[in-house]
Every structure is written in structure tokens, then in C-alpha cells.
Interface confidence: low
């Protein structure tokens, strides 16, 4: 792949990551969300083949809007298939900085042992894996994907009381659903899905993440 194409891909991936962080409630400046390809080149370089940028230079650290001490890393490993050694380096970094959540943007995937280590480290350290291919577009901006809103505990309690339901009576959505992964929705949370409706203006459904 030539430098121009790779620079474009890195810009698109980083842009989606910034939108994802913003949509999860982390503080991302408007100029980061709006960053043009030219601005990306000015900030990072346009010669990935010569290490400008290296993928590790795209590392992101964001703080949550509600609690600035709640921070999240986004790592961009150099190696195409990420091994357990890299995961250990990231965990050490997280430990040093007292950060418990991170996203890892991988080029081709992870080794089975690296994947298993993510499971083993939860819930102390939450590391989520994204394939860079999935981040070339922002799935939530696709016209066929309805708006998803993660509900607070209070909102779920009110919803269940209003409809005289138990939580397990709600329809399900898989934790591995692409939109659920985008928002980082955990098992047991409830998501409100808002679709446009010709008759009712909008049609709302509720789903329990499993």
C-alpha cells in the first residue's frame, strides 16, 4: 500500500476513534472531531513507510466528561497480529497511569493467547479490540443503523416499572453486536433504539445486552 493510501486510512480510523470516544462521553475537542486529512498530515506526517507517523504515535488518551479521572487509552500496535507481549506492555502502562480501560486497534487480529489475556484481565482492566477495517467507516453514521442510546440504571428502573416488566422480559441484543461494541455497552445494560417511523414519527424499542 502506498503512503497516500495508508495516510488516508490512518486518518479515517483515527477520526472514527475520536467520534467513538466522544459518543462514549469522553472529552474530545471539536477540532479533533473535524480534523481534515491535511490537518492530520500536518500533525502526524504523510510518510508512514518512513515512520511518520508510526502507529504508536496515534495513541490517544481521553478523559470522561463526567469524571476527568476516568480515562481511556486507545492503542495502535505496530505488529499486524498482536501477541501477549504487547498486551502486557499496555497493561503495565495502564497500571503506571492508573487507567483501567483501553481500546486496541489491530491491523489483522490477535493471537489466541492475547485474546485470552483480555478475558483474564477483566474486570480489573477492560481492553477492547477493534479491527482497523471496522473503523474505516463509522457504523453509527450508516443510514440503516438507528440511533442507540445507553440507558442509565434509573431510566431502566423507571422503564420496567412503567411497563410492569422484569429485566429478563426485554428483547435481547448481543454484546458482540457492532453497535454495542462501538458504544462499549456491557452485558446487563439496556439500550434504547430509536427508529424513524412513518406513522408515529419515531418508534422506540428497548434491548437488554447479553
Amino acid at each position: 500500500m502506498d503512503d497516500e493510501e495508508e495516510t488516508y486510512r490512518l486518518w479515517k480510523i483515527r477520526k472514527t476513534i475520536m467520534q467513538l470516544c466522544h459518543d462514549r462521553g469522553y472529552l474530545v475537542t471539536q477540532d479533533e472531531l473535524d480534523q481534515t486529512l491535511e490537518e492530520f498530515k500536518a500533525q502526524f506526517g504523510d510518510k508512514p513507510s518512513e515512520g511518520r507517523p508510526r502507529r504508536t504515535d496515534l495513541t490517544v488518551l481521553v478523559a470522561h466528561n463526567d469524571d476527568p479521572t476516568d480515562q481511556m487509552f486507545v492503542f495502535f500496535p505496530e505488529e499486524p497480529k498482536v501477541g501477549i507481549k504487547t498486551i502486557k506492555v499496555y497493561c503495565q502502562r495502564m497500571q503506571e497511569e492508573n487507567i483501567t480501560r483501553a481500546l486496541i486497534v489491530v491491523q489483522q487480529g490477535m493471537t489466541p493467547s492475547a485474546k485470552q489475556s483480555l478475558v483474564d484481565m477483566a474486570p480489573k482492566y477492560i481492553l477492547e479490540q477493534f479491527l482497523q477495517q471496522e473503523l474505516l467507516i463509522n457504523i453509527t453514521e450508516h443510514e440503516l443503523v438507528p440511533e442507540h442510546v445507553v440507558m442509565t440504571k434509573e431510566e431502566v428502573t423507571e422503564l420496567l416499572a412503567r411497563y410492569k416488566l422484569r429485566e429478563n422480559q426485554l428483547p435481547r441484543i448481543q454484546a458482540g453486536d457492532p453497535v454495542a461494541r462501538y458504544f462499549g455497552i456491557k452485558r446487563g445494560q439496556v439500550v434504547k433504539i430509536i427508529r424513524p417511523s412513518e406513522t408515529a414519527g419515531r418508534y422506540i424499542t428497548y434491548r437488554l445486552v447479553q
Epitope: L27, E39, A42, G45, G51, T56, D57
Partner: antibody, heavy 125, light 102 residues
């Protein structure tokens, strides 16, 4: 407490070489990009180079090909290797730390909140 | 490269005066600008970043404003320790550039 301590300055002849070091303490060095900035006598501040947390380097046009910016995270040390020195390179050289980690990346930009006291380099025959 | 132009290059003022410095960028740098204070024999000190954010520990008499290409540093009531040279710096992209100083 954050500290940056430069060393290695001195008198060098035109065309000669010199290596400056900057030892950092009081913060997680590996998480931060680092920069060298200089001030020539009676002049303003001039940015020289930047080494990202992932080792990516950026240089000012005036030093490209002559200066090399590098880092050793295991020793919390930033280096500036200068060769082909000219009279115009005579200056006080500062190492500087950005106020946010992963600067030059992520949501942050390069604003330098901590500076060393500077190392004086004199290029003269 | 982005050129940064400061004005005035120097000014005379007295303790208690309100003082303003301006900095102009050769292209739109949004709010990616910092102001530093430099005194002889001392290391530069960050005063303002992101055009208007006051660095921790910097007195509130210092303030910054502007975005795009035009920026201002203001000192509301000049103190004896404020007599120094002030530099603006763009952080929009590489190469990083400073103004010539005021």
C-alpha cells in the same frame, strides 16, 4: 516534582559534533513526546525537533540532516546529536515536556509546561 | 510552514497598567496557540495554552483570547515581576513555530 536536566553543552569548532542529553524525572517519560528548543543570543525561541512517544521524529528545516533527536525510555533520557555545527547554531538549548501525554497524537497539542535550565552550545574557532 | 507574527515588538508600561500583546498566524490554527514568558537566565514559562486556558499556577491577571489567525495575551494589572519577553507558539502542526517575541 517534574525535573529536566540538560548536559553536554560546551565550545565546539565549526563542522564539529556534540551530543546533548536531557534526563527527565517526576513523570512517566515514555508516555510523553519531547522536544528541543533553542535560543540564540539576543534572538527568540526556535523549535528544533520533537520525538513522539512512539519514536516518530519531526525536525525544523534548518537542522534536518545535521541533527538527530532520539530517546532512551529505559533511562528517561532525551538526546540531541548535533553534527556539521555552524556559528548560527550557537545558542542555549532547552529540552521541553508537553503538558499532555501522547502529544502530537490523540486529542492533544504541543504546549510545553516544563523546560530544563538549558545547555549552552558555542560554535567558534 | 505557519508563520507567527507578534506585535508590538516592545512596549513601555508601568506597574498597574493593562497590557495587551497580539499574535497573528499566517493560516487558520483554530485555537492551537500558547503564550510563554521568558526572563533572562531563566527557562521559558507556559502561561496560556489552547489560546485561552490558564496554565496551573499562573496568576489570573494573565488571560488569552482569539481563534483562527488572531490572538491576544492580556495582563490586567502589570506587576513588577511581569516585565519580561512574551512569545506565542502555534501547536497546530509540525514544524512548531514561535513568534519573534514582544
Amino acid at each position: 516534582e517534574v525535573q529536566l536536566l540538560e548536559s553536554g553543552g560546551g565550545l565546539v569548532q565549526p563542522g564539529g559534533s556534540l551530543r546533548l542529553s536531557c534526563v527527565a524525572s517526576g513523570f512517566t517519560f515514555a508516555s510523553y513526546g519531547m522536544a528541543w528548543v533553542r535560543q540564540a543570543p539576543g534572538q527568540g525561541l526556535t523549535w528544533i525537533c520533537f520525538v513522539g512517544s512512539g519514536d516518530t521524529t519531526h525536525y525544523a528545516e534548518s537542522v534536518k540532516g545535521r541533527f538527530t533527536c532520539s530517546r532512551d525510555n529505559s533511562n528517561n533520557t532525551l538526546y540531541l546529536h548535533m553534527s556539521g555545527l555552524r556559528g548560527a547554531d550557537t545558542a542555549k538549548y532547552y529540552c521541553a515536556k508537553p503538558n499532555s501525554p501522547f502529544t502530537g497524537s490523540g486529542s492533544f497539542h504541543n504546549y510545553f509546561d516544563y523546560w530544563g535550565q538549558g545547555a549552552l552550545v558555542i560554535v567558534s574557532s | 510552514d505557519i508563520q507567527m507574527t507578534q506585535s508590538p515588538s516592545s512596549l513601555s508600561a508601568s506597574v498597574g497598567d493593562r497590557v495587551t500583546f497580539t499574535c497573528r498566524a499566517s493560516q487558520n490554527i483554530r485555537n492551537n496557540l500558547a503564550w510563554y514568558q521568558l526572563k533572562p537566565g531563566k527557562a521559558p514559562q507556559l502561561l496560556i495554552y489552547s489560546a485561552s486556558s490558564l496554565e496551573t499556577g499562573v496568576p489570573s491577571r494573565f488571560s488569552g483570547s482569539g481563534s483562527g489567525t488572531d490572538f491576544t495575551l492580556a495582563i490586567s494589572s502589570l506587576q513588577p515581576e511581569d516585565f519580561a519577553t512574551y512569545y506565542c507558539q502555534q501547536a497546530h502542526g509540525f514544524p512548531i513555530t514561535f513568534g519573534q517575541g514582544s
